[in-house]
């Protein structure tokens, strides 16, 4: 008789990333008997929830249940019914909810309470909804990319999983950009840190890692734009803001009350003689870059060296994976190739920003205007953040790899979060088992 593989014992896990601009649900699967091996967990589905981030539901919490329905139902379809009850569900909220909590713990609690009640109604093993710290967000993103790149594996391979993977065990740094915060996490050369708040120690698969991490709240691309607008409107002579970060011919009316809604613009808040102002794009990369640089306070540093705003940053070390909005924006601008130098990126940004808005709309007819209008700012912001904020140079630029997925799994904090909460990253290297997970009869 022909040998027939017995059905694998597969496990599933669900993580919801409740970001500032939207929520995404990720479904992961792995062979049960290999759950302590490195690199066996992979993403089988991403479902993007329709609508804004959960922090925007403060005024309409009764709509949260409906908001989550489609993606939770999708999870019900993807995961075999027999596995539902043992499939853990975790929701982690990030900077959008950190900002809401900063304004009001009550409102943040209320949103999370309704989210928890909604998720408890599904047949899965709901493990809770919480606001994760910026440090966790950075650390789990670092764990995710290094897990997927096989950096924790003690077995050196004769092949490369992904084009930029080297066969050495040096970990990649992680650069994460969201709508409301950005994280930088890496293993510095020097293990002593001047700032204990930024230091993390891990023991993973039998190896110790001393990791630097920092999350810059308000420096995600959306909140950075609000900051820039609040800063620039202070010196506007009237209710017209001629803005170099938007394409020539672009026009948009902004409510002052919306501008000052976020704690991120608090330092720029002032009484203005108007309730609304109009952004008029002038599309000038160089001027936009200068305006963005004013968001980074580099004049004060209580350490040997800083990123910006007095935050310690050790010298950059090794390769970095830049994901989430770093990737989405650079991918839209077609600037993710390893061959594109920093000078070339700057040149392309100058060209892109100076293109008339009408031309841009025609060239990218399928893209929502709200998103389309902000790529000039976002691209400029990414360059400014990486070069002036984190001190990458034209030379070290080649060490930045813009990553969307690794081996079919999205780069981001969610996989690392689940691996940690399900205890799937052992401190010690597991003993290798003689049998593979497929048993033949």
């Amino acid at each position: 008789t022909q040998n027939k593989a017995l059905p694998e014992n597969i496990k599933y896990g669900i993580v919801l990333d409740a970001g500032s601009s939207h929520t995404s649900l990720y479904i992961y699967k792995w062979p049960a008997e290999k759950e302590n091996d490195t690199g066996v967990v992979h993403q089988v589905e991403e479902c993007r929830v329709k609508g804004p981030g959960i922090s925007k539901y403060v005024q309409k919490v009764n709509e949260i249940g409906i908001y989550l329905t489609d993606c939770m139902e999708r999870a019900r379809e993807v995961i075999p019914r027999s596995q539902h009850q043992e499939t853990p569900v975790y929701l982690g909220a990030t900077a959008g909810m950190r900002l809401l909590r900063m304004e009001s713990e009550e409102l943040a609690d209320r949103v999370l309470d309704v989210v928890e009640r909604s998720l408890s109604n599904y047949p899965f093993d709901f493990q809770g909804a919480r606001i994760i710290t910026g440090q966790e967000e950075g650390a789990y993103g670092w764990i995710t990319i290094n897990y997927l790149l096989g950096k924790f594996s003690q077995k050196t391979r004769w092949f490369s999983i992904v084009p930029y993977e080297t066969n050495n065990q040096e970990t990649f740094g992680a650069l994460d950009l969201g709508g409301a915060s950005t994280q930088i996490t890496f293993v510095p050369q020097n293990q002593t840190t001047e700032s204990p708040d930024n230091a993390l120690q891990f023991r993973l698969y039998g190896k110790d890692y001393n990791v630097y991490t920092h999350s810059f709240l308000c420096y995600g691309k959306d909140q950075a734009l609000w900051q820039k607008l609040a800063k620039d409107i202070q010196v506007a002579s009237n209710e017209i803001l001629r803005d170099p970060c938007f394409h020539p011919g672009y026009k948009k009316v902004v409510n002052v009350s919306d501008l000052y809604k976020t704690p991120c613009t608090k330092r720029f808040e002032m009484t203005l003689p108007f309730q609304q102002f109009e952004i008029q794009g002038i599309g000038n990369y160089q001027q936009c870059h200068q305006s963005v640089l004013e968001l980074f306070n580099t004049s004060y540093c209580p350490y040997s060296q800083c990123a910006f705003n007095g935050i310690f940053l050790p010298p950059l070390q090794g390769d970095f994976g830049a994901f989430s909005a770093f990737y989405f924006v650079m991918n839209f601008l077609n600037l993710t190739s390893e061959k594109v130098s920093q000078e070339k990126v700057t040149e392309m940004m100058k060209k892109f920003c100076s293109q008339p808005w009408e031309e841009i709309k025609t060239s990218y007819a399928g893209v929502k205007e709200k998103y389309l209008s902000e790529y000039c700012f976002s691209g400029t912001y990414i360059l400014s953040l990486l070069l002036q904020g984190y001190h990458f140079t034209a030379d070290s630029w080649e060490h930045i790899h813009f990553i969307g997925k690794i081996q079919g799994s999205d780069a981001g904090w969610t996989l690392g979060y689940m691996l940690n909460l399900t205890n799937m990253i052992p401190a010690e290297q597991p003993l290798s088992t003689p049998l593979s997970h497929s048993t033949y009869v």
Epitope: Q59, M102, R110, C218, P263, R267
Partner: antibody, heavy 116, light 111 residues
Framework: QVQLVQSGAEVKKPGASVKVSCKAS????????MHWVRQAPGQRLEWMGY????????TFSQKFKGRATITVDTSASTAYMELSSLRSEDTAVYYC?????????WGQGTLVTVSS | DIVMTQSPDSLAVSLGERATINCKAS??????????MYWFQQKPGQPPKLLIY???NQGSGVPDRFSGSGSGTDFTLTISSLQAEDVAVYYC?????????FGGGTKVEIK
């Protein structure tokens, strides 16, 4: 655990300024606002203002605008409240309190006495 | 400014008996379905301690005998069975809008 530790008692002359510090520990300092509340002897609690440690933006009660300044040193996780042009009615215990809208954690208080 | 009026100014209650303190706001302190109303306990020489937040939620480590109720403009703090250690001044506070304001306080004593 969350702790707010304030500087010691001060005696000041009318017209002088006082600067009270509040050192925070046990949480990410920039994730929560820091408020200042005072209480004159035998009087009700009086909210003065708050700061967003994240960026140094502050808001004050009208009564203290122009006379009170709130600052932070994020590297030291410390907030400061400075009150200028002191008068005898500023004699009070000054408290820092962590919160957005919920003042769950308070400093032990700093007694400021204004006397000629 | 929202004015918070507490009553009574002082209250003497026998041990084990119920104590009720009222607080009236000059305008509603509700927003987005949440009451931005808080109750604090303050003992001599100590900072205030949060008892109740959001009008009816117990603060961390607060005994079950303390409860809060109300919405809009009228709120109540109840101590179901007064204990000796509950002797203190109790304050209500609103944080719906700046300036955040406190009530005048209610002194609770043992009869």
């Amino acid at each position: 655990q969350v702790q707010l530790v304030q500087s010691g008692a001060e005696v000041k002359k009318p017209g002088a300024s006082v600067k009270v510090s509040c050192k925070a520990s046990g949480y990410t300092f920039t994730d929560y606002n820091m408020h200042w509340v005072r209480q004159a002897p035998g009087q009700r609690l009086e909210w003065m203002g708050y700061i967003v440690p994240l960026n140094g933006g502050s808001t004050f009660s009208q009564k203290f605008k122009g006379r009170a300044t709130i600052t932070v040193d994020t590297s030291a996780s410390t907030a400061y409240m400075e009150l200028s042009s002191l008068r005898s009615e500023d004699t009070a215990v000054y408290y820092c309190a962590r919160g957005g809208t919920r003042f769950a954690y308070w400093g032990q208080g700093t007694l400021v006495t204004v006397s000629s | 400014d929202i004015v918070m009026t507490q009553s009574p100014d002082s209250l003497a209650v026998s041990l084990g008996e119920r104590a009720t303190i009222n607080c009236k706001a000059s305008e509603s302190v509700d927003n987005f379905g949440v009451s931005f109303m808080y109750w604090f306990q303050q003992k001599p020489g100590q900072p205030p301690k949060l008892l109740i937040y959001g009008a009816s939620n117990q603060g961390s480590g607060v005994p079950d005998r303390f409860s809060g109720s109300g919405s809009g403009t009228d709120f109540t703090l109840t101590i179901s069975s007064l204990q000796a250690e509950d002797v203190a001044v109790y304050y209500c506070q609103q944080t719906k809008e700046v300036p955040y304001t406190f009530g005048g306080g209610t002194k609770v004593e043992i009869k």
